[in-house]
């Protein structure tokens, strides 16, 4: 059929609750493209009728709710003027009652369901809620061992649960719950999270060194594509996170809809005394709004930024 297969994504999901998956793959989906969802190599596209339990909502496939029989491979076909790409999504639906048993026995749970708090620190858990804008999400409630979390040490901040002065007792099974409203109907979203406690310092006990960038500006023409590496050295046993942020937000979250600016996949080279990590940021198309904004590379407690600048006019051309 002339479509190029890009990748396979595996998702393990809970039955009886809403689920959505967004078909995005920059730079392919950043241009003028059409997106169509199919199930199990069917030639018939997923319905776009919003009353259907399973339907396509713009680039998303939306299950309201997910059911046991929905397991299978779904294809998202991205057609451009001269191209065709296909993403495969393998959905496995399981029956899960978070309060009945531990989620420890479930296979290959994603990192969204396994989170870490740092002993003695102020830290946070994240409730991962990925839905199209047609879905209105009610206030998030947090539970530990099936009891609603209350107390001075806890604050709900958007999709986060802030935990101050983390103690060993904070380990355990958590869940975040929200009511999703779509076309006048309400559905419950409940995400279970297994929380472990680490005694390591909040950022791995080491101070990573950012080799590049060095808090400087980069001259770049409007409309061009730009890739900037963040190079970091750190101890071999570190637990530091490395990422790019803008406006105090992960770039992948900040540009969640447009995908115009993305963080790359981290790579590292191992040396005898340390590791050298590289994580890049890709600007598919530099826009005016990007100039003058600090794009921050974070590595544990270390930060460094780049600021994009318009090149100075070349007066020799006149």
């Amino acid at each position: 059929d002339g479509c190029k297969d890009i990748f396979m994504k595996n998702e393990i999901l809970s039955a009886s609750q809403p689920f959505a998956f967004n078909c995005t793959f920059p730079p392919i989906t950043s241009g003028e493209v059409s997106v169509t969802w199919y199930k199990n190599s069917s030639k018939i596209p997923v319905s776009k009728i919003i009353q259907s339990r399973i339907h396509q909502d713009e680039t998303w496939i939306l299950f309201l709710p997910m059911e046991w029989g929905d397991s299978g491979v779904y294809q998202c076909v991205i057609k451009g003027r001269d191209s065709c790409h296909r993403i495969h999504v393998n959905l496995t639906v399981f029956e899960k009652h978070w309060c009945d048993t531990s989620i420890g026995g479930l296979p290959n749970l994603s990192d969204e369901y396994k989170q870490i708090l740092h002993l003695g620190k102020d830290d946070s858990l994240t409730c991962h809620l990925h839905f199209p804008k047609s879905c209105v999400l009610g206030p998030i409630k947090w539970y530990k061992d099936c009891n609603e979390i209350k107390g001075e040490r806890f604050t709900v901040l958007e999709t986060r649960l802030l935990v101050s002065n983390v103690s060993a007792e904070d380990r355990g099974n958590y869940a975040c719950q929200a009511i999703l409203t779509h076309s006048g109907k309400q559905y419950e979203v409940l995400n279970g999270i297994t929380v472990s406690i680490t005694e390591r310092a909040g950022y791995g006990g080491s101070v990573p060194k950012i080799i590049y960038p060095k808090n400087h500006s980069i001259e770049v023409q409007l409309g061009t594509t730009l890739i900037v590496d963040c190079n970091v050295t750190d101890t071999k046993d570190n637990t530091n996170l490395r990422c790019w942020r803008v406006n105090n937000t992960l770039v992948d979250d900040y540009y969640d809809e447009s995908k115009r600016i993305r963080e790359g996949v981290e790579t590292h080279v191992s040396f005898r005394e340390h590791n050298l990590y590289t994580v890049n940021i890709t600007f598919l198309e530099v826009k005016m709004e990007d100039y003058g904004l600090p794009f921050m590379c974070h590595a544990g407690v270390s930060t460094a930024y780049i600021i994009l600048q318009l090149p100075a006019p070349d007066f020799r051309a006149y």
Partner: antibody, heavy 117, light 107 residues
Framework: DVQFQESGPGLVKPSQTLSLTCTVT?????????WNWIRQPPGKGLEWIGY???????NYNPSLKSRVTITRDTSKNQFSLKLSSVTAADTATYFC??????????WGQGTLVTVSS | DIQMTQSPSSLSASVGDRVTITCRAS??????LNWYQQKPGKAPKLLIY???RLHSGVPSRFSPSGSGTDYTFTISSLQPEDIATYYC?????????FGGGTKVEIK
């Protein structure tokens, strides 16, 4: 819960420097997020002044940038605002607030600063 | 800077009425739109973040929608405790900016 308390003089003379401090309880300002100052002149709308992030980097509203400095004292879990060369137009209620990934999620109750000789 | 234009600047409605406030951005803000409620002499309180997510403790009569440059905020059944000024705010591009506010009063 994360809570805020703004403090500082309620009256500042024109051309002087306005200084305010925000004391945060319930969460360390070095753990995450951006810690902001926002102001509201009497009977008017809201204006974002700037922030200091958990890592210590700052960002200011260009309209005030030349006059604003935001610093922090991590030992006291406080961040501070200095606004130089004030005029009557700087008379406002000044709020401190935490910004999550999307919004100014929680605010202090605000402190009114009047610029007058 | 991104300009945020709110309308109307004030409105008067009866208890139980459906009330709608609109907010228009001068450029696409990609759903990075928040709504706040401010009562006289108090700090603003977050109601809705990222276009369609209700903050902790916010009742379901507050209903948001919108995308691109145009956003709306609806109170399905106005209650006496909803008397306040409502502000929209964009969190897409620095400097973060607010709408001029909509004052909601009871008839």
């Amino acid at each position: 819960d994360v809570q805020f308390q703004e403090s500082g003089p309620g009256l500042v003379k024109p051309s002087q420097t306005l200084s305010l401090t925000c004391t945060v309880t319930g969460y360390s300002i070095t753990s995450d997020f951006a810690w902001n100052w926002i102001r509201q002149p009497p009977g008017k709308g809201l204006e974002w002044i700037g922030y200091i992030s958990y890592s210590g980097d700052t960002n200011y509203n260009p309209s005030l940038k030349s006059r604003v400095t935001i610093t922090r004292d991590t030992s006291k879990n406080q961040f501070s605002l200095k606004l130089s060369s004030v005029t009557a137009a700087d008379t406002a209620t000044y709020f401190c607030a935490i910004r999550g990934p999307y919004s100014f999620t929680y605010w202090g109750q605000g402190t009114l600063v009047t610029v007058s000789s | 800077d991104i300009q945020m234009t709110q309308s109307p600047s004030s409105l008067s409605a009866s208890v139980g009425d459906r009330v709608t406030i609109t907010c228009r951005a001068s450029q696409d803000i990609n759903n990075y739109l928040n709504w706040y409620q401010q009562k006289p002499g108090k700090a603003p309180k977050l109601l809705i973040y990222y276009t369609s997510r209700l903050h902790s403790g916010v009742p379901s009569r507050f209903s948001p929608s919108g995308s691109g440059t145009d956003y709306t905020f609806t109170i399905s059944s106005l209650q006496p405790e909803d008397i306040a000024t409502y502000y929209c705010q964009q969190g897409h591009t620095l400097p973060w900016t607010f709408g001029g506010g909509t004052k909601v009063e009871i008839k």
